[in-house]
């Protein structure tokens, strides 16, 4: 039975040209996190495998950095980076948990972080 919940940074905003950290956290389960996939819509950004380490998609290698932790750092942001991002937690023995983050990249210097929220 899947009892865990994914907590994410929720709706966030950042300035064009800047960087942002995408973070998710799995709680309320003793399941082992074996792999975390980071995806933007249907595009794979990066994978963190508990044993094998990190894989960064070739098309994002220049702008994506692994970490901190299981999170992902997006650099040199453009307006085109605005959209939904998903952290997909593969766990053993529970199965798969998914969290959602919405990033808005702003032209102006006004960029405030949104509140955290949970996805069961």
């Amino acid at each position: 039975m899947m009892t865990g919940t994914i907590e994410t940074t929720g709706n966030i905003s950042a300035e064009k040209g800047g960087s942002i950290i995408l973070q998710c956290h799995l709680s309320s389960t003793t399941a082992q996190v074996t792999q975390v996939n980071w995806e933007q819509q249907d595009q794979l950004l990066a994978i963190c495998n508990a044993d094998l380490g990190w894989h960064i998609s070739p098309s994002f290698k220049d702008r994506v950095a692994p970490g901190p932790g299981l999170g992902l750092t997006l650099q040199s942001l453009t307006v085109n980076d605005t959209g939904e991002y998903f952290c997909i937690y593969h766990t053993y023995p529970d199965g798969t948990y998914t969290g959602r983050i919405f990033l808005e990249v702003l032209e102006s210097s006004v960029a405030e972080h949104g509140a955290r929220f949970q996805i069961p």
């Epitope: 792999q35 995806e39 094998l52 380490g53 894989h55 593969h90 023995p93």
Partner: antibody, heavy 125, light 107 residues
Framework: QVQLQESGPGLVKPSETLSLTCTVS??????????LAWIRQPPGKGLEWIGS???????YYNPSLESRVTISVDTSKNQFSLKLSSVTAADTAVYYC?????????????????WGQGTMVTVSS | EIVMTQSPATLSVSPGERATLSCRAS??????LAWYQQKPGQAPRLLIY???TRATGIPARFSGSGSGTEFTLTISSLQSEDFAVYYC?????????FGGGTKVEIK
């Protein structure tokens, strides 16, 4: 190019423990970033994943076999092994060892990239 | 555990024709799907990973497509050496699971 070779008895008696070894050549387990896996195939049937181990000792087992399975690794001999206890005729199969995730860092996929030739194990008295 | 279902169980095709094999997952596996080919008396061989990327040395006549729960392996023009059993497999969720296989035989 990494190659795998299974070895062990071809005949095991019911209720005994099946023991197989996979020898890895062409690469070092201790420095390899991949899973070492066991998969079996009963005669005329499909493939069944038994379990996988990482060089650090992390193990993952098929829940249907977990109570009877032990997979271990011996980096000094460049080998990994399978032990399956309390066997019955239903455990008769070709047993394959395989490497999984060898290309993960470059290509981001985890699949069974390299397979041994397989060894037939019959459970019979 | 994710259950993989392949159809049809047997596919009869003439050499040179197109073969289309299906694989369905009981829940979404995104694009984390591999296809293997197995000939009699041999170990399986990796054909496709990531649902659509050919493994090293695999001919262009093999192509994979799909994501989520529905996947397809297409062999555009069957050669004599392609008559074999094909398996799909999901990963990374543990436990790894295979489909029951599709046997492609000569019509």
């Amino acid at each position: 190019q990494v190659q795998l070779q299974e070895s062990g008895p071809g005949l095991v008696k019911p209720s005994e423990t099946l023991s197989l070894t996979c020898t890895v050549s062409g690469g070092s387990i201790s420095s390899g970033s991949y899973y070492l896996a066991w998969i079996r195939q009963p005669p005329g049937k499909g493939l069944e994943w038994i379990g996988s181990i990482f060089r650090s000792g992390s193990t993952y087992y098929n829940p249907s076999l977990e109570s009877r399975v032990t997979i271990s690794v011996d980096t000094s001999k460049n080998q990994f092994s399978l032990k399956l206890s309390s066997v019955t005729a239903a455990d008769t199969a070709v047993y394959y060892c395989a490497i999984e995730g060898a290309n993960f860092k470059d290509f981001g996929y985890v699949a069974f990239d390299i397979w041994g030739q397989g060894t037939m194990v019959t459970v019979s008295s | 555990e994710i259950v993989m279902t392949q159809s049809p169980a047997t596919l009869s095709v003439s050499p040179g024709e197109r073969a289309t094999l299906s694989c369905r997952a009981s829940q979404s596996v995104s694009s984390n799907l591999a296809w293997y080919q197995q000939k009699p008396g041999q170990a399986p061989r990796l054909l496709i990973y990531g649902a659509s990327t050919r493994a090293t040395g695999i001919p262009a006549r093999f192509s994979g497509s799909g994501s989520g729960t529905e996947f397809t392996l297409t062999i555009s023009s069957l050669q004599s050496e392609d008559f074999a059993v094909y398996y799909c497999q999901q990963s990374p969720p543990w436990p790894r699971t295979f489909g029951g296989g599709t046997k492609v035989e000569i019509k």
